[in-house]
Structures are given as structure tokens and as C-alpha cells.
Interface confidence: low
């Protein structure tokens, strides 16, 4: 509003007095002085209060104050005229925009408020004080319109594994004044940054560059913007995505022999990692898959194996960025054809080592049972040499026997027992390979000693055949069994040195 | 402020598929990710899936994989959640979640909706 | 999976933690829900941001695979069932919440 308006509201008496007051202290030290800020800070769309206060002595008054801005380079522009008598007057330029802050008002505050400071509203003001009876009193102050910046962030092209110094992302912010755009991230990259200055603002462009790789993904890069007119810094958080694909294995096949026919719930899964996530694709190398093989996904179930789910198997994984394969050979096994496989290490060494033992025993069986039979043999030889001998002498020691009462019945047990543990049938063996030790009693009879020692070694060598020999060979074995003997009153005694005698086939003793 | 409202809940037949729509109101909607987390009744909270501000990448909780397909409109600041084949254990109350940044993480929800009952019964 | 107690108490005054553990997590975000079918209300995201209209006494934080939330002069409003959450990064399909650890205000 323009002074004038103030002045004819104020009326010709008054504004005459206050002109011959204003004159005649101008060019004097003031009484007051004006209080006010250099500059007023206001963010966009808050309100910003334009102080003014004038600070004089008692009983001095304001009149008036008038707000107007005087950017340099262009003329003053009025915003308002504060009257003490007729209150605010706004100029059409900010009507609705300017207000008195509200009460309790101090008449000699002459403050204002400019509602929902806009960026244009940025400039410089000038508070004009008309006071009673000091006179009038100026001051300018400037206001600053912060803008809080918009950051936006852009993700830079696609990240793949094996890139060289990628764009990652980039941060825009615009504000006025310019805007601090910095990266907070645990990744390492490079970062470059550019401004753009507008007419009333600046823009501020970040870049952040890295070199991808798969440790990187799912890690935030946060775009940090700092301003004066932000309360607290504002944080625009982008999750890096790396493209890449893990080479491919199979698992299942760890223990060849769980793969035998019969066996259930037998399958083959495919590892791998990729992003973006990878899908999976079963093949047979030599032929279709098998009917009743599953596929789900990763995994190849397979029913109850047989032998035509035998083959090679691959897995083929692949995602947008590339693709793997890995392939299995599946051998079924028989358990009837390969349970000679499954014995394991000991009982295979037990099974040789016994069936060694078995063939060196049997070996020692047939070496004794081979001896054994040669020294029988040998035995028959001299029993029927020394029958022969003692032919002549059967009768007079059968008389002689009779003589002297002894009856083979008579015997003592001891002698029964010898004779039965002594011969051949009774010697009864349950294992297969029996050794009978024949040696000491049974061959080498160095002296005769007693009857009953005859008696036993006659029963055991006796043979039951060979009369014809006998006959034949009679008169030489008469002569050589005569060596053996002394003949004494009508019998005949063993000489001390003689070999075994053996006497009648049928166990009489003499 | 931030709002979240969800809309197509209700009663359900089970083998049967379930459309839920949120929209989003006081943010700039493509800017961030977005989730849906449900409820069981007496349980605790559980992670349906989520969208990427850009709507060009999707995850789905373990649960729903293979039944479920989340969508976004960035111009009408909507998201969907399609859930087919429905079952007596997706019963509960689904919430539309906005994450603080431009993924769908668990981690870093700051704003929810109210929720929306969902009854899957014959 | 993720892990955490089924259960905590404190006084009002008192300093209480709750901890959610994970094999890969490297961000936890912490959930206040008062009564079940109530919604979530956030108090921690991306391990230790907290929204601007939770109290001070909220805080989050991270050491090795395990988040904790402190709540420092827990109050009686305080008390509510607490869920973590996680994304793992290592899958892209793994965003996983905890059990709930109910808060007991004694």
C-alpha cells in the first residue's frame, strides 16, 4: 500500500505535526534504535516472520511502519503499512500473504509475517518506523528462501559379474542453496560428482561407480543429500542386483552303492546360485528320461530304480545372464550280480585265511594218513616175518601155557583195557583229517619186558590173513626166529636183546 | 503422512483364487518397494512377497511360491496380490507394507496398512 | 530361519533387549504390534533408522548375525509382541520374520 493512502487515512492535522516533529529531530541522535535481523532464513512453504522492533526511550510511540521491498536494481515495491490507529493495510501484491503475528502485540513491534515464502519472496526488505516524538527509523534485512532439494535416484544400467567400472547409480538433487549429494555404502566405488546452477538454484548430479561382483548383491547404496533447509538428511536407498550364474553340480551320487535296483526315494538334486534366481532343466544325455522320473525344479526324483534308469544325466541351470551344465552317470546296480561286492575287507580276509588254513590242514591230513599207512604196512611185513619164525615153537609153548594154568579169561582188566584202547577200531575220531601216532608202541620194541606188554603189542599188529605166506616160508622163519630164543628144560625163553615176540594170532600169551 | 489401504478380502472358496489391491497415498509410490505380510490367527507375522519400485522384480515367501504373482501400477500407486489355489491355511489378515527404499526386504518396512481379513472356507 | 526369545519382562523404568538372530542377515527391522490383528507399527528399519514419530528410547542395532533391539525407560505402552525381520540377499526370494518375542511391562 502506498504511503499516501497512510497519510490521508492519517489527516492533514496530524501528519503536519508529525512532518514538524520528524524535522525537528532529524540530523539529531535518535532516542531509539530499530531491532532487526541481517537475514531471515525460511524454508519453502514456511512462514517467515520480518522483525522489527523499535527499542526507544518511555513514553515514546510508534506512528507507523511500512515493509517494502527494495531489491537493488529495481524500485521499491510496498508489501504493507502497519498503522498504529488503523491497523494493517496489505498491497494487492501479497494480499492474504502478509499478517501482524499474533497477539499480545507490543505497539511498539512492528514485526510482520509473510505466509508460505515461495522462492521469489527470496530478497531484500526494508522496515520503515515513523516514531513520535523521535522521528522515523530504518532498517533493512534480507531474506533467504531455502528450496530443500527433491533428490531422485536413478539405478545405472544392469549389473553383471566380469564388467569392468560400472555406472551403479546416479543422485539428482536441486535445491537452492546447492545441495551436498554424497554415498553411504559398505561397497567399494568410485564416486564424481557435477553442478548445474540455475537462475534461483542448483542441481547437484552424483555418480557411483564400482566393479560388479556377486558379494555385492542385496547391499544398499544410499544416496545422501544434505541441505540447510532439511532438518535431517534425506536418504534415497538403491539395493545393488549383480547379475551372475554359479557353476553347476549334482549331489545325490555321493554313495555309488545306495543306487541299487528296488531302492526308493532315490534322487539327484542340482546346486547352483545365480541372480536373477536360475531354473533348472533335466535331460538324459543317452535318451529320454525314464517314465516315472520326476522333475521338480532343482531336483530329479526317481520312482523304485530299475536298470533302465541307468545313464547320464545333466543338469542344465540358466538365468538372463547365462547358462551352466553339469552331468552324472547313474549306474543301477544288481544286488544279486554285485553282492560279491559288497563283502567287505574283513570278511573277505577271514573267508581267504580259513580257506588256507582248511587246505594246509587237509594237506597235513594227507601226509600223516599217507606215513601212517606206509608204517602199517611196514608192521604187517615184520609181524608176519616173526609168526613165521615162531611156527615151531607154537606147541610146546601152548603146552607149556596150559602147564602153568593161565587162561586167557584170567587176565587182569588192566591188560583187557590195553588191548582195547590200543586197537585200531577203537580209535574213533570225529574230525575229518584224524592222526594216529603209532610210533612209540606200535614199531620199535626194543625189550620185551612183561607178558602183558606182549599180549597188548600181539592184539594191535596182529594180521588177520597171510596164512599162505606163512606155510611157505616156514623152515627159513624157523631158523631166524630160533636167534631170538633159548631153549631151557623143554621151552623156549625170549633172549634179552631179542625184538617183540608175537605168538598165535589169537591173543594167547606166553 | 503415509497411507496404505487394502481392498479384497472377504470370504473365500478354498482351491479358489484371491485378488487383494493396495493403494498407496502420500509418498512418491515408485519410488519405493512394496511387500504384502500376512497373519495367521494366533500367529505371527509372515512374508507373502514383494515388488521392487520399479515392478521389475518380484519374491515370494516360501509359503505362496508358485501360487502367488505380485504386480504394480506406478501410475495409479497400486499394487496387486493374486493368490490362486487358495487354502484353509491362507487364512488371516494381509498387510500392504512400504519399504524405506526401492526393494521389498523385511527389513526395512516403514509404513503398513491396516490390513484386510481374508477367510479361505467352503 | 530367524531366532528369537518367545519372551522378555522389565520394569517400567528399566532398560530392556531383544535380540533376532539369522544365518545371513545383514539388516534387521523391528515390528510393534500391541494385539494380534492390530497392525504393525515400525520402530526400527535397515538394523538401526528409527521412523521419526518413535520415541528416542527405541534403538536398533547389529553385531555379527544378530540384531537387537533396545528399548531404553521401557514404559507400560511399551508392552506388545516385537517381531524382527530380515531379507536375505544371498536368495532375492528370502524376507523372513521372527516368531515374536512378547514384551512383559512388570
Known amino acids: 500500500m502506498p504511503l499516501s493512502l497512510g497519510a490521508e487515512m492519517w489527516g492533514p492535522e496530524a501528519w503536519l505535526l508529525l512532518l514538524l516533529l520528524l524535522a525537528s529531530f532529524t540530523g539529531r541522535c535518535p532516542a531509539g534504535e530499530l531491532e532487526t535481523s541481517d537475514v531471515v532464513t525460511v524454508v519453502l512453504g514456511q512462514d517467515a516472520k520480518l522483525p522489527c522492533f523499535y527499542r526507544g526511550d518511555s513514553g515514546e510511540q510508534v506512528g507507523q511502519v511500512a515493509w517494502a521491498r527494495v531489491d537493488a536494481g529495481e524500485g521499491a515495491q510496498e508489501l504493507a503499512l502497519l498503522h498504529s490507529k488503523y491497523g494493517l493495510h496489505v498491497s494487492p501484491a501479497y494480499e492474504g500473504r502478509v499478517e501482524q503475528p499474533p497477539p499480545p502485540r507490543n505497539p511498539l513491534d512492528g514485526s510482520v509475517l509473510l505466509r508460505n515464502a515461495v522462492q521469489a519472496d527470496e530478497g531484500e526488505y526494508e522496515c520503515r518506523v515513523s516514531t513520535f516524538p523521535a522521528g522515523s527509523f530504518q532498517a533493512r534485512l534480507r531474506l533467504r528462501v531455502l528450496v530443500p532439494p527433491l533428490p531422485s535416484l536413478n539405478p545405472g544400467p544392469a549389473l553383471e559379474e566380469g564388467q569392468g567400472l560400472t555406472l551403479a547409480a546416479s543422485c539428482t538433487a536441486e535445491g537452492s542453496p546447492a545441495p551436498s549429494v554424497t554415498w553411504d555404502t559398505e561397497v567399494k566405488g568410485t564416486t564424481s560428482s557435477r553442478s548445474f546452477k540455475h537462475s534461483r538454484s542448483a542441481a547437484v548430479t552424483s555418480e557411483f561407480h564400482l566393479v560388479p561382483s556377486r558379494s555385492m548383491n542385496g547391499q544398499p547404496l544410499t544416496c545422501v543429500v544434505s541441505h540447510p533447509g532439511l532438518l535431517q538428511d534425506q536418504r534415497i536407498t538403491h539395493i545393488l542386483h549383480v547379475s551372475f550364474l554359479a557353476e553347476a553340480s549334482v549331489r545325490g551320487l555321493e554313495d555309488q552303492n545306495l543306487w541299487h535296483i528296488g531302492r526308493e526315494g532315490a534322487m539327484l538334486k542340482c546346486l547352483s546360485e545365480g541372480q536373477p534366481p536360475p531354473s533348472y532343466n533335466w535331460t538324459r544325455l543317452d535318451g529320454p528320461l525314464p517314465s516315472g522320473v520326476r522333475v521338480d525344479g532343482d531336483t530329479l526324483g526317481f520312482p523304485p530304480l530299475t536298470t533302465e534308469h541307468s545313464g547320464i544325466y545333466v543338469c542344465h541351470v540358466s538365468n538372463e545372464f547365462s547358462s551352466r551344465d553339469s552331468q552324472v552317470t547313474v549306474d543301477v546296480l544288481d544286488p544279486q550280480e554285485d553282492s560279491g561286492k559288497q563283502v567287505d575287507l574283513v570278511s573277505a580276509s577271514v573267508v581267504v585265511v580259513g580257506v588256507i588254513a582248511a587246505l594246509l590242514f587237509c594237506l597235513l591230513v594227507v601226509v600223516v594218513v599217507l606215513m601212517s599207512r606206509y608204517h602199517r604196512r611196514k608192521a604187517q611185513q615184520m609181524t608176519q616175518k616173526y609168526e613165521e619164525e615162531l611156527t615151531l615153537t607154537r606147541e610146546n609153548s601152548i603146552r607149556r601155557l596150559h602147564s602153568h594154568h593161565t587162561d586167557p579169561r584170567s587176565q587182569p582188566e588192566e591188560s583187557v583195557g590195553l588191548r582195547a584202547e590200543g586197537h585200531p577200531d577203537s580209535l574213533k575220531d570225529n574230525s575229518s583229517c584224524s592222526v594216529m601216532s603209532e610210533e612209540p608202541e606200535g614199531r620199535s620194541y626194543s625189550t620185551l619186558t612183561t607178558v602183558r606188554e606182549i599180549e597188548t603189542q600181539t592184539e594191535l599188529l596182529s594180521p588177520g590173513s597171510g596164512r599162505a605166506e606163512e606155510e611157505e616160508d616156514q623152515d627159513e622163519g624157523i631158523k631166524q626166529a630160533m636167534n631170538h630164543f633159548v631153549q631151557e628144560n623143554g621151552t623156549l625163553r625170549a633172549k634179552p636183546t631179542g625184538n617183540g615176540i608175537y605168538i598165535n594170532g589169537r591173543g594167547h600169551l606166553v | 503422512t503415509v497411507t496404505l489401504d487394502e481392498s479384497g478380502g472377504g470370504l473365500q472358496t478354498p482351491g479358489g483364487g484371491l485378488s487383494l489391491v493396495c493403494k498407496g497415498s502420500g509418498f512418491t509410490f515408485s519410488s519405493n518397494g512394496m511387500a504384502w505380510v500376512r497373519q495367521a490367527p494366533g500367529k505371527g507375522l509372515e512374508f507373502v512377497g514383494g515388488v521392487n519400485a520399479a515392478g521389475s522384480w518380484t519374491g515370494y515367501g516360501a509359503a505362496v511360491k508358485g501360487r502367488a504373482t505380485i504386480s504394480r501400477d506406478n501410475g495409479q500407486s497400486t499394487v496387486r496380490l493374486q493368490l490362486n489355489d487358495l487354502r484353509a491355511e491362507d487364512t488371516g489378515t494381509y498387510y500392504c507394507?512400504?519399504?524405506?527404499?526401492?526393494?521389498?526386504?523385511?527389513?526395512?518396512?516403514?509404513?503398513w496398512g491396516h490390513g484386510t481379513e481374508v477367510i479361505v472356507s467352503s | 530361519a530367524l531366532t528369537q526369545p518367545s519372551s522378555v519382562s522389565a520394569n517400567p523404568g528399566e532398560t530392556v533387549e531383544v535380540t533376532c538372530s539369522g544365518d545371513d542377515s545383514r539388516y534387521y527391522g523391528w515390528y510393534q504390534q500391541k494385539s494380534p490383528g492390530s497392525a504393525p507399527v515400525t520402530v526400527i528399519y535397515y538394523n538401526d533408522k528409527r521412523p521419526s514419530d518413535i520415541p528416542s528410547r527405541f534403538s536398533g542395532s547389529k553385531s555379527g548375525s544378530t540384531g537387537t533391539l533396545t528399548i531404553t525407560g521401557v514404559q507400560a505402552e511399551d508392552e506388545a509382541v516385537y517381531f524382527c525381520g530380515a531379507y536375505d540377499s544371498t536368495t532375492h526370494s528370502g524376507s523372513a520374520f521372527g516368531a515374536g518375542t512378547t514384551l512383559t511391562v512388570l
Open positions: 507394507a512400504k519399504t524405506a527404499d526401492d526393494w521389498y526386504g523385511a527389513d526395512d518396512i516403514d509404513a
